[in-house]
């Protein structure tokens, strides 16, 4: 059993999130993940989900009673989602930490917009669409 | 020429982001995008970048002088990044709109954590690594 399971159960107790009523009114993430099978689509969604959890954990960083659980889960996210690649994790963190209200950040973002847009679609990089994208609009 | 280019130039004027000094102290997004060649890695990063732009545009939604430019660019992002797929865009928006300080959202997130974690690595879904991932750790 992966180490995160035990620690996630510990967090469930702390957040009182083990009760069946928590699932009322649908899921946050699971329903959305079920919609997307293509790996690149899943990464688009998981990127937002992982950043949500990192933000949530940051908000509870001073709570010693759950620190071990949080650290173990974050470590497992590093392994699973970032493939143990610190550079990938660091680049991701940089992006999540940019402040949208910082004037210098705003100017830089707009300055880079054209180039960012040019790289957004897979075709821009590969020069061709993948066959799977030709069969059905992903 | 894609329609976003003219509108992005318009935003550059509005944000005073055309000057070369804007590029001082490095880039926000372009340097990071340069690091990642594998499509799924790029989607992880681009997901954060696109959500940044959406947040930025939201902050200026009442400014009539740039509304046409913002709408054109958002539309082009829908085409390029979400492949004109409204469901993909809607699911993405849902994820970006969850409040990390909402107690019900926190409880749901922790309730779903074990299942989310189980799906994080590509191997979990496919049972095998893609050959391109075999060449170099992404």
């Amino acid at each position: 059993q992966d180490p995160y399971v035990k620690e996630a159960e510990n967090l469930k107790k702390y957040f009182n999130a083990g009760h069946s009523d928590v699932a009322d009114n649908g899921t946050l993430f699971l329903g959305i993940l079920k919609n997307w099978k293509e790996e690149s689509d899943r990464k688009i969604m998981q990127s937002q989900i992982v950043s949500f959890y990192f933000k949530l954990f940051k908000n509870f960083k001073d709570d010693q009673s759950i620190q071990k659980s949080v650290e173990t889960i974050k470590e497992d996210m590093n392994v699973k989602f970032f493939n143990s690649n610190k550079k990938k994790r660091d680049d991701f963190e940089k992006l999540t930490n940019y402040s949208v209200t910082d004037l210098n950040v705003q100017r830089k973002a707009i300055h880079e917009l054209i180039q960012v847009m040019a790289e957004l679609s897979p075709a821009a990089k590969t020069g061709k669409r993948k066959r799977s994208q030709m069969l059905f609009r992903g | 020429q894609d329609p976003y280019v003219k509108e992005a130039e318009n935003l550059k004027k509005y944000f005073n982001a055309g000057h070369s000094d804007v590029a001082d102290n490095g880039t926000l997004f372009l340097g990071i995008l340069k690091n990642w060649k594998e499509e799924s890695d790029r989607k992880i990063m681009q997901s954060q970048i696109v959500s940044f732009y959406f947040k930025l545009f939201k902050n200026f939604k009442d400014d009539q002088s740039i509304q046409k430019s913002v709408e054109t660019i958002k539309e082009d992002m829908n085409v390029k990044f979400f492949n004109s797929n409204k469901k993909k865009r809607d699911d993405f928006e849902k994820l970006t709109n969850y409040s990390v300080t909402d107690l019900n959202v926190q409880r749901k997130a922790i309730h779903e954590l074990i299942q989310v974690m189980a799906e994080l690595s590509p191997a979990a879904k496919t049972g095998k690594r893609k050959r391109s991932q075999m060449l170099f750790r992404g």
Epitope: D2, P3, Y4, K68, E71, T72, K74, E75, D76, N78, V79, F82, N83, S84, N85, K86, K87, K88, D90 | K34, N35, W36, K37, E38, D41, R129, Q133, M134, L135, F136, R137, G138
Partner: antibody, heavy 120, light 111 residues
Framework: EVQLLESGGGLVQPGGSLRLSCAAS????????MSWVRQAPGKGLEWVSA????????YYADSVKGRFTISRDNSKNTLYLQMNSLRAEDTAVYYC?????????????WGKGTTVTVSS | NFMLTQPHSVSESPGKTVTISCAGS????????VQWYQQRPGSAPTAVIY?????PSGVPDRFSGSIDSSSNSASLTISGLKTEDEADYYC??????????FGGGTKVTVL
């Protein structure tokens, strides 16, 4: 100050076993991944194995996979390397190293090494 | 298998600058951090550059690291060469399957 002290090296016959230990101090042991790196006489550095901070993820070089097992006891601040089916080419100085984060990172601090000799 | 290739040796006079290259065999070297370790004879290695271009505390700013995506290589530059810089230098990064990879090492000789 970070201190890493390897022990358990020695002379062993081909096919035999050894267990190396690395006693760590001066940092929060469970928060960092740990690695073993070896250096054959007159040769370069060769990474052997690594383990994440919690011990939940382990990584091995192809040359030792299936023969060596890395483990850690966070309550004792100790890293281990169980080496089975030893070969002459496993002869080397074995270094224990602290990684720079909780998965694979840069090798921030190194021990002085312990020598393993595999010979009949 | 992913490999990192370094020159066997470089030599230069005191006060001069030496650059050691580290070429990746496949993939994109920019997709992982590159580290550089110094090893003096009879001692354990120590990091002089980590995460592409960061210097650990205590390492002089004469040491610098860089990545060149176009040539898929990393470089360690030592400026103002000193006799104490004479050592073996190893670059290190990672391969696809979470294996740590070292270059073969470069012997730096101060003439």
């Amino acid at each position: 100050e970070v201190q890493l002290l390897e022990s358990g090296g020695g002379l062993v016959q081909p096919g035999g076993s050894l267990r190396l230990s690395c006693a760590a101090s001066g940092f929060t042991f469970s928060s960092y991944a740990m690695s073993w790196v070896r250096q054959a006489p007159g040769k370069g550095l060769e990474w052997v194995s690594a383990i994440s901070g919690s011990g939940g993820s382990t990584y091995y070089a192809d040359s030792v996979k299936g023969r060596f097992t890395i483990s850690r006891d966070n309550s004792k601040n100790t890293l281990y390397l169980q080496m089975n089916s030893l070969r002459a080419e496993d002869t080397a100085v074995y270094y224990c190293a602290k990684d720079g984060w909780n998965a694979l990172g840069w090798l921030e601090s190194w021990g002085k090494g312990t020598t393993v000799t595999v010979s009949s | 298998n992913f490999m990192l290739t370094q020159p066997h040796s470089v030599s230069e006079s005191p006060g001069k600058t030496v650059t050691i290259s580290c070429a990746g065999s496949s993939g994109s070297i920019a997709s992982n951090y590159v580290q550089w370790y110094q090893q003096r004879p009879g001692s354990a290695p120590t990091a002089v550059i980590y995460e592409d271009n960061q210097r650990p505390s205590g390492v002089p700013d004469r040491f610098s690291g860089s990545i060149d995506s176009s040539s898929n290589s990393a470089s360690l530059t030592i400026s103002g060469l000193k006799t104490e810089d004479e050592a073996d230098y190893y670059c290190q990064s990672y391969s696809y399957n979470n294996q740590v990879v070292f270059g073969g090492g470069t012997k730096v000789t101060v003439l």
